[in-house]
C-alpha cells in the first residue's frame, strides 16, 4: 500500500532505535571516510525530520522518496570533493540516477585501519558512560568498513556485542570475559559479510533471477516439506529483502525482512517443524535464527527424481510450457532431496539439466537423449566431494596455521601477480575453512567447505577487478558465480609469470616482530612465505618446509636473545644466504 | 501459454493424400523437437512421427513408414504432416506434441480414411 510519508512510515514501522541505527548504517557505508560524529549529527536530523512526518504526513518534504532525502543529507556536507573526489558527481545527478551513483562508489576495500578493540577496562568506562554511542560507534566502524553488510544482520550483532559487554564489566576480571566473547562475535560477523557481499554480487552481476535460484536451493534444503509454492513465496521475499538491502534500501529492508520473519512464524505448519524456537524470540534474534535455522527431516516418502523430470514423456512439454517453473520445480526437487550438496553444486547441477533439455529436446527423440541425464551428474558431485576430503586431510594433518600456509603457496603459484597482502588475506580466509567445516559431521561438510569457499574467491574477485593483474584470475572471475570455485581450484602454476627477482629488504626482519601479537607474526612469516613462492614459483614443497623452518628457528632464537636488536642484525643476512641457496 | 492448433484434416478415399498442419504459439518453436500422435476409435494413443528443431532429423513409426513425410516451417512456427496412400486404419484424430510427448493438450483434427 502506498504511504503519504515513506519515512514516516518506516520510522512508525521499525521504531526509533532501529530507525537510527539503519540510517546510520546507510551513511556510513555510503560515506566511509567521515567520522561518527559527522554521521551521527546527520541521523539525528533525519530523525528529527522523520518525527515531525509522523506528526503530520502532510509536513514539508514529507512526500520525498527516502532516496531523495537521504541523498539530499549527503550532498550537502561540506567539502564532498575534497574527502571524495568523483564520488561528488554523484550529486549532480537526479534519482534514481543519484542513488546507482552512490552504489557504484561503494569502496570494498577501503583505505581504513584495522577496526581496533580497546582495551577491556576502557571499553567497559565508555560502554557505561554512553551505551548508545558505544553502540553507534560499533555500527560506523563496522558499516564503513563492510559497506555491503547486511544492515539488520548488523544490528543483531550489536545487540550481541552490547548483551557481552553488560555482562561482562559486571565481572572482576573482564578481560577474560570479554575476549573469546567478541572474538566469537567478531568471526561470525565477518563471515556474515563475505556471504552478504557474494549475495549482492549475485544480484548485481546475473539480477535477481540468479538471487531467487540460489534462494530456491537453500531453502528447499532447510525445508524440504514445504511445498514448491510455499518455496517460491519465501524465495520472492528474501530476493527482495536482499535486493532492498544491496541496493542501500535499509530501512525498507529491514522492515520487509521483519514481515518475512512473521509471515513464516505465522505458518509454521506449512514451511517446517523447527521454527518455534526461533518464533519465541524478540525480532532481531528470531530472524537471524530463522536464516540459520537447522534443516527439517526430509520427508521419507519421496520419490525418485527420475520419475518426473527424466522417464515422463512429458518433459519438453512441461519445459516449453513453463521453463523457469519447470527448471525452478526441478530445483527444488533436487534441493529437498540433498541436504548434504553444497547451493553452488545443486545450482550447477540445474544448469546441466537445463542444457540438456535445450539439446535435447530440439532433437527428433527427446527422451532417448536426456535419458542419461542423471548419470552425467557423477562428475559434477564427485569433483567437490574430492575437493572436501583432500583438503579437511590436510587441515588435520596441518592444523590452521599450515593448512593456511600449503593454501598460500598454491594461490600464489596459481597467481603470483596479485598482490601480496590479498594473497595473504585470502590464503588466511580460505584456511578458515578447515576450522569451521572439517570438523563437522559427514554429511555437512560439502556445503559449508564450498559455498564458504565460494564467498571468499568473491571477495578475492573483487579486490582483482580494481586492479586487474592476472588472467588466470580474470578468467575465473568473468564466468558465472557458481563455476569460479571449481575454476580457481583448477588452475595451476602461471606458466606466463617472470619470477621476481629476490630483494634482501623483503626477508629482512627487526626486533619489533617480536612483540607482535601471534596473528600479527604469522601475517608477517606468511608475506615473506608469497614472496619466496613469487622469487620461485615451482619451488618445492620440501624447499619451502626447510627455509620457513629456518625462518621460524631464527624468529624463535632472536627473540628469545637477550640483545635482540643484534640478534637481528647479524643472524637476519645468514637466513636470508641460507634461504637464496636453499631455493637454487 | 502454448498453444497448439491443428486443421487439414477430413474425409478422404483409400489411396488419397491429405496434409495436416498445426500451427504453434507460446514458446520458441524452433527449440523444440515436435512429433504427431494419433488415437484410432476406441483405441489408445499411438506415436506416428518426430521431427528436430531444425528441422534436418526425422523419425517415423513403421505402420507409416515411407507414406507419411513431416516438415516444419520454423519462420511460421508451423508443423507439417504429409499423409499419402491413406488407408482405412490411418483413421483417427492426429494431435501434434511437443518433444516426445504422448498425451495432447490440444483439440487435434479428425481424419476419416473411408470409401
Known amino acids: 500500500e502506498a504511504h503519504k510519508s515513506e519515512i514516516a512510515h518506516r520510522y512508525n514501522d521499525l521504531g526509533e532505535q532501529h530507525f537510527k541505527g539503519l540510517v546510520l548504517i546507510a551513511f556510513s557505508q555510503y560515506l566511509q571516510k567521515c567520522s561518527y560524529d559527522e554521521h551521527a549529527k546527520l541521523v539525528q536530523e533525519v530523525t528529527d525530520f522523520a518525527k515531525t512526518c509522523v506528526a503530520d504526513e502532510s509536513a514539508a518534504n514529507c512526500d520525498k522518496s527516502l532516496h531523495t532525502l537521504f541523498g539530499d543529507k549527503l550532498c550537502a556536507i561540506p567539502n564532498l570533493r575534497e574527502n571524495y573526489g568523483e564520488l561528488a558527481d554523484c550529486c549532480t545527478k537526479q534519482e534514481p540516477e543519484r542513488n546507482e551513483c552512490f552504489l557504484q562508489h561503494k569502496d570494498d576495500n577501503p583505505s581504513l585501519p584495522p577496526f581496533e578493540r580497546p582495551e577491556a577496562e576502557a571499553m567497559c568506562t565508555s560502554f557505561k558512560e554512553n551505551p548508545t554511542t558505544f553502540m553507534g560507534h560499533y555500527l560506523h566502524e563496522v558499516a564503513r568498513r563492510h559497506p555491503y553488510f547486511y544492515a539488520p544482520e548488523l544490528l543483531y550483532y550489536a545487540e550481541q556485542y552490547n548483551e557481552i559487554l553488560t555482562q561482562c564489566c559486571a565481572e572482576a576480571d573482564k578481560e577474560s570475559c570479554l575476549t573469546p566473547k567478541l572474538d566469537g562475535v567478531k568471526e561470525k560477523a565477518l563471515v556474515s559479510s563475505v556471504r552478504q557481499r557474494m549475495k549482492c554480487s549475485s544480484m548485481q552481476k546475473f539480477g535477481e533471477r540468479a538471487f531467487k535460484a540460489w534462494a530456491v536451493a537453500r531453502l528447499s534444503q532447510t525445508f524440504p516439506n514445504a511445498d514448491f509454492a510455499e518455496i517460491t513465496k519465501l524465495a520472492t521475499d528474501l530476493t527482495k529483502v536482499n535486493k532492498e538491502c544491496c541496493h542501500g534500501d535499509l530501512l525498507e529492508c529491514a522492515d520487509d525482512r521483519a514481515e518475512l520473519a512473521k509471515y513464516m512464524c505465522e505458518n509454521q505448519a506449512t514451511i517446517s517443524s523447527k521454527l518455534q524456537t526461533c518464533c519465541d524470540k524478540p525480532l532481531l534474534k528470531k530472524a537471524h535464527c530463522l536464516s540459520e535455522v537447522e534443516h527439517d527431516t526430509m520427508p521419507a516418502d519421496l520419490p525418485a527424481i527420475a520419475a518426473d523430470f527424466v522417464e515422463d514423456q512429458e518433459v519438453c512439454k512441461n519445459y516449453a510450457e513453463a521453463k523457469d517453473v519447470f527448471l525452478g520445480t526441478f530445483l527444488y526437487e533436487y534441493s529437498r532431496r540433498h541436504p548434504d550438496y553444497s547451493v553452488s553444486l545443486l545450482l550447477r547441477l540445474a544448469k546441466k539439466y537445463e542444457a540438456t533439455l535445450e539439446k535435447c529436446c530440439a532433437e527428433a527423440n527427446p527422451p532417448a537423449c536426456y535419458g542419461t541425464v542423471l548419470a552425467e551428474f557423477q562428475p559434477l558431485v564427485e569433483e567437490p566431494k574430492n575437493l572436501v576430503k583432500t583438503n579437511c586431510d590436510l587441515y588435520e594433518k596441518l592444523g590452521e596455521y599450515g593448512f593456511q600456509n600449503a593454501i598460500l603457496v598454491r594461490y600464489t603459484q596459481k597467481a603470483p601477480q596479485v598482490s601480496t597482502p590479498t594473497l595473504v588475506e585470502a590464503a588466511r580466509n580460505l584456511g578458515r575453512v578447515g576450522t569451521k567445516c572439517c570438523t563437522l559431521p559427514e554429511d555437512q561438510r560439502l556445503p559449508c567447505v564450498e559455498d564458504y569457499l565460494s564467498a571468499i574467491l568473491n571477495r578475492v574477485c573483487l579486490l582483482h577487478e580494481k586492479t586487474p593483474v592476472s588472467e588466470h584470475v580474470t578468467k575465473c572471475c568473468s564466468g558465472s558465480l557458481v563455476e569460479r570455485r571449481p575454476c580457481f581450484s583448477a588452475l595451476t602454476v602461471d606458466e606466463t609469470y617472470v619470477p621476481k627477482e629476490f630483494k634482501a629488504e623483503t626477508f629482512t626482519f627487526h626486533s619489533d616482530i617480536c612483540t607482535l601479537p601471534e596473528k600479527e607474526k604469522q601475517i608477517k612469516k606468511q608475506t615473506a612465505l608469497a614472496e619466496l613462492v613469487k622469487h620461485k614459483p615451482k619451488a618445492t614443497a620440501e624447499q619451502l618446509k626447510t627455509v620457513m623452518d629456518d625462518f621460524a628457528q631464527f624468529l624463535d632464537t632472536c627473540c628469545k636473545a637477550a640483545d635482540k636488536d643484534t640478534c637481528f642484525s647479524t643472524e637476519g643476512p645468514n637466513l636470508v644466504t641460507r634461504c637464496k641457496d636453499a631455493l637454487a | 501459454e502454448v498453444q497448439l492448433v491443428e486443421s487439414g484434416g477430413g474425409l478422404v478415399q483409400p489411396g488419397n493424400s491429405l496434409r495436416l498442419s498445426c500451427a504453434a504459439s507460446g514458446f520458441t518453436f524452433s527449440s523444440f523437437g515436435m512429433s504427431w500422435v494419433r488415437q484410432a476409435p476406441g483405441k489408445g494413443l499411438e506415436w506416428v512421427s518426430s521431427?528436430?528443431?531444425?528441422?534436418?532429423?526425422?523419425l517415423y513409426a513403421d505402420s507409416v513408414k515411407g507414406r507419411f513425410t513431416i516438415s516444419r516451417d520454423n519462420a511460421k512456427t508451423t508443423l507439417y504432416l504429409q499423409m499419402n496412400s491413406l488407408r482405412p486404419e490411418d483413421t483417427a484424430v492426429y494431435y501434434c506434441?511437443?518433444?516426445?510427448?504422448?498425451?495432447?493438450s490440444s483439440q487435434g483434427t479428425l481424419v476419416t480414411v473411408s470409401s
Open positions: 506434441t511437443i518433444g516426445g510427448s504422448l498425451s495432447p
Open positions: 521431427i528436430s528443431g531444425s528441422g534436418d532429423d526425422t
